[in-house]
């Protein structure tokens, strides 16, 4: 699920995807929910 581009000599360019944080108790100034597990 990550997007990584490479120049021909293999140097990685760009950033991998950054999931948006979930704030399940949005009505509080809170810490973000831990990212869901990758499968």
């Amino acid at each position: 699920s990550y997007s990584m581009e490479h120049f021909r000599w293999g140097k990685p360019v760009g950033k991998k995807r950054r999931p948006v944080k979930v704030y399940p108790n949005g009505a509080e100034d809170e810490s973000a929910e831990a990212f869901p597990l990758e499968f």
Epitope: R18, Y23, D29
Partner: antibody, heavy 113, light 112 residues
Framework: EVQLVESGGGLVQPGGSLRLSCAAS????????MIWVRQAPGKGLESIGI???????YYASSAKGRFTISRDNSKNTLYLQMNSLRAEDTAVYYC???????WGQGTLVTVSS | DIQMTQSPSTLSASVGDRVTITCQAS??????LAWYQQKPGKAPKLLIY???TLASGVPSRFSGSGSGTEFTLTISSLQPDDFATYYC??????????????FGGGTKVEIK
């Protein structure tokens, strides 16, 4: 109380510009991922762009090159600068705290001559 | 951009019915999938995140499943308050080459 209040919508001519504001209370905008979402009349939700907590911004294809998301930490406010507006940009614009129930009430932008 | 395809676009059902809405992502998004409910003139309400985790205060008749590209929202026994429009949302996030925060087209659940 945690809330988001959008402002700055209105009638603008095609090709014009508008800056929307999203004032946050009850939390610090710069500590959270924030998304702009719009909804054309009678249509579905469309994500426009995101500003991550570290300030990085990314845009949907429909917004890239025309729209810019920024924030003013001293005012605890998020902005959406919209340029080269088209009729199809007519919508209610919402700011959203990440994935959550914290949405603004929306502000209507009408692009028409 | 990630494309989210929802089906059906409209669903006619009766109180007590079991309702299933599907959402397909154009590429794998792991389980970074949320479901929202929206009623006319209101902002959307978060129902489910991480594909299957119920948001606070959401009735247990709502459930979500799936991972990768195929996801499902199920309402086990439709209640009068459930007639609304439902949206799936990918929040896998973005990279320099692709925007990964997208909504499905919506499913309107109406009274049969």
């Amino acid at each position: 109380e945690v809330q988001l209040v959008e402002s700055g919508g209105g009638l603008v001519q095609p090709g014009g510009s508008l800056r929307l504001s999203c004032a946050a209370s009850g939390f610090t905008v710069s500590k959270y991922d924030m998304i702009w979402v719009r909804q054309a009349p009678g249509k579905g939700l469309e994500s426009i762009g995101i500003i991550y907590d570290d300030g990085d911004t990314y845009y949907a294809s429909s917004a890239k090159g025309r729209f810019t998301i920024s924030r003013d930490n001293s005012k605890n406010t998020l902005y959406l600068q919209m340029n080269s507006l088209r009729a199809e940009d007519t919508a209610v614009y919402y700011c959203v705290k990440g994935v959550s129930n914290i949405w603004g009430q929306g502000t209507l932008v009408t692009v028409s001559s | 951009d990630i494309q989210m395809t929802q089906s059906p676009s409209t669903l006619s059902a009766s109180v007590g019915d079991r309702v299933t809405i599907t959402c397909q992502a154009s590429q794998s998004i792991s389980n970074y999938l949320a479901w929202y409910q929206q009623k006319p003139g209101k902002a959307p309400k978060l129902l489910i995140y991480s594909a299957s985790t119920l948001a606070s205060g959401v009735p247990s008749r709502f459930s979500g499943s799936g991972s990768g590209t195929e996801f499902t929202l199920t309402i086990s026994s439709l209640q009068p308050d459930d007639f609304a429009t439902y949206y799936c949302q990918s929040y896998e996030g973005s990279s320099s080459s692709s925007y990964g925060v997208g909504f499905g087209g919506g499913t309107k659940v109406e009274i049969k």
